[in-house]
């Protein structure tokens, strides 16, 4: 995490694409976080970020149950939240936001996906009056083509993030398989 007080400002939303004709049922299932970029993400060469996985499960009300599983301190950590559909397909907000202290807004926007291989998702939140944003590159597998990774780097840079704010988590087997 970036501990500095000067965060790179979040981009105007008009610079963030939204996947057209988003199919919520096809987006379900497990996604590996192959790439991660954000104004509070910093590349740590001594302690590289480990890959984690996020599972999207569609509920009857068309919200997603979203579970991220991380390998931390020799055990599996689970982080569960709800993404509630916004006014546009592919756009979401956080369910029960009042239960997150200091969090005043949360936006999720699916930038692009082909559902069966890769996706890019933009997140923006205001917490303790500070605006954070990140972009995730999701893969249905732990490896994606260099072309997809380069496109992710380009997009992250277009939103103002330099190279040291863009990481490619190291694939692991613990917790995220199965």
């Amino acid at each position: 995490q970036d501990s500095t007080s000067d965060l790179i400002p979040a981009p105007p939303l008009s610079k963030v694409p939204l996947q057209q004709n988003f199919q919520d049922n096809q987006f379900q299932g497990k996604w590996y976080v192959v790439g991660l970029a954000g104004n509070a993400i910093l590349r740590e060469d001594k302690d590289p970020q480990k890959m984690y996985a996020t599972i999207y499960e569609l509920k009857e009300d068309k919200s997603y149950n979203v579970t991220s599983v991380l390998f931390r301190k020799k055990k599996c950590d689970y982080w569960i939240r709800t993404f509630v559909p916004g006014c546009q397909p592919g756009e979401f907000t956080l369910g029960n936001i009042k239960s997150y202290p200091g969090l005043t807004s949360y936006l999720v926007r699916v930038v692009s996906t082909n559902y069966n291989q890769h996706a890019m998702v933009f997140f923006k939140k205001v917490s303790q009056n500070r605006e954070y944003f990140k972009i995730t590159l999701y893969g249905r597998t732990k490896e994606l083509t260099s072309e997809l990774k380069e496109n992710f780097i380009r997009f992250s840079k277009s939103l103002g993030l330099p190279e040291n704010h863009i990481v490619f988590p190291v694939p692991i087997d613990q917790c995220i398989d199965g």
Partner: antibody, heavy 118, light 113 residues
Framework: KIQLVQSGPELKKPGETVKISCKAS????????MNWVKQAPGKGLKWMGW????????TYAEEFKGRFAFSLETSATTAFLQINNLKNEDTATYLC???????????WGQGTIVTVSS | DIVMTQSPSSLSVSAGEKVTLSCKSS????????????LAWYQQKPGQPPKLLIY???TRDSGVPDRFTGSGSGADFTLTISSVQAEDLAVYYC?????????FGAGTKLELK
């Protein structure tokens, strides 16, 4: 006082190249994205794309991919638009416009008229 | 891309009249998380660049006279000029500020009767 000052009018022949400048002053140049907008004679506004000043990464609208290039000279707080292999339909006023974090484009250059004619 | 449709394309008015300009988007411009509508209005006078009037559908930019009012939500927006002055004769554009790429309406030309 915040200002965006663009270079003067250009008269070019088809196939030639033009490079327009947009000099920013009165604010921290690297803190705001710069947009380019095309306005053909008597027509409306068409967003061409933008360049992130922090990283220098350009993004182009679909229609403006290929012959168009955005660049920067950060030390001179200047953004550039280059159009290669000019066509008659490139005849227009080109405007630079600064991103606002509140919304929209809050400061605009005066525009540069480019005329393409043989 | 989001299509912005403005009406009417031109309007003849007398000084002091109240004027209402319409802008409709092909998709909602509302972000439910922060309850903001991402729409901007611009004024362009002949031979000049556009000038930002309204952002967030209803917030006047600094220095914009209070006779200009932006309203609406979702996909339906309005710019109202409560009492038109001679200096308001211009073309007015709305702009999708919600998602990539930013798109403009074709404009409404305000003319003097």
């Amino acid at each position: 006082k915040i200002q965006l000052v663009q270079s003067g009018p250009e008269l070019k022949k088809p196939g030639e190249t033009v490079k327009i400048s947009c000099k920013a002053s009165g604010y921290t140049f690297t803190n705001y994205g710069m947009n380019w907008v095309k306005q053909a004679p008597g027509k409306g506004l068409k967003w061409m794309g933008w360049i992130n000043i922090n990283t220098g990464e350009p993004t182009y609208a679909e229609e403006f991919k290929g012959r168009f290039a955005f660049s920067l000279e950060t030390s001179a707080t200047t953004a550039f638009l280059q159009i290669n292999n000019l066509k008659n339909e490139d005849t227009a006023t080109y405007l630079c416009a600064r991103d606002s974090y509140s919304g929209g484009f809050d400061y605009w250059g005066q525009g540069t008229i480019v005329t393409v004619s043989s | 891309d989001i299509v912005m449709t403005q009406s009417p394309s031109s309007l003849s008015v007398s000084a002091g009249e109240k004027v209402t300009l319409s802008c409709k988007s092909s998709q909602s411009l509302l972000i439910s998380g922060d309850q903001k509508n991402y729409l901007a209005w611009y004024q362009q006078k002949p031979g000049q660049p556009p000038k930002l009037l309204i952002y967030g559908a209803s917030t006047r930019d600094s220095g914009v006279p209070d006779r200009f009012t932006g309203s609406g939500s979702g996909a339906d927006f309005t710019l109202t000029i409560s009492s038109v002055q001679a200096e308001d004769l211009a073309v007015y554009y709305c702009q999708n500020d919600h998602s990539f790429p930013p798109t403009f309406g074709a404009g409404t030309k305000l003319e003097l009767k």
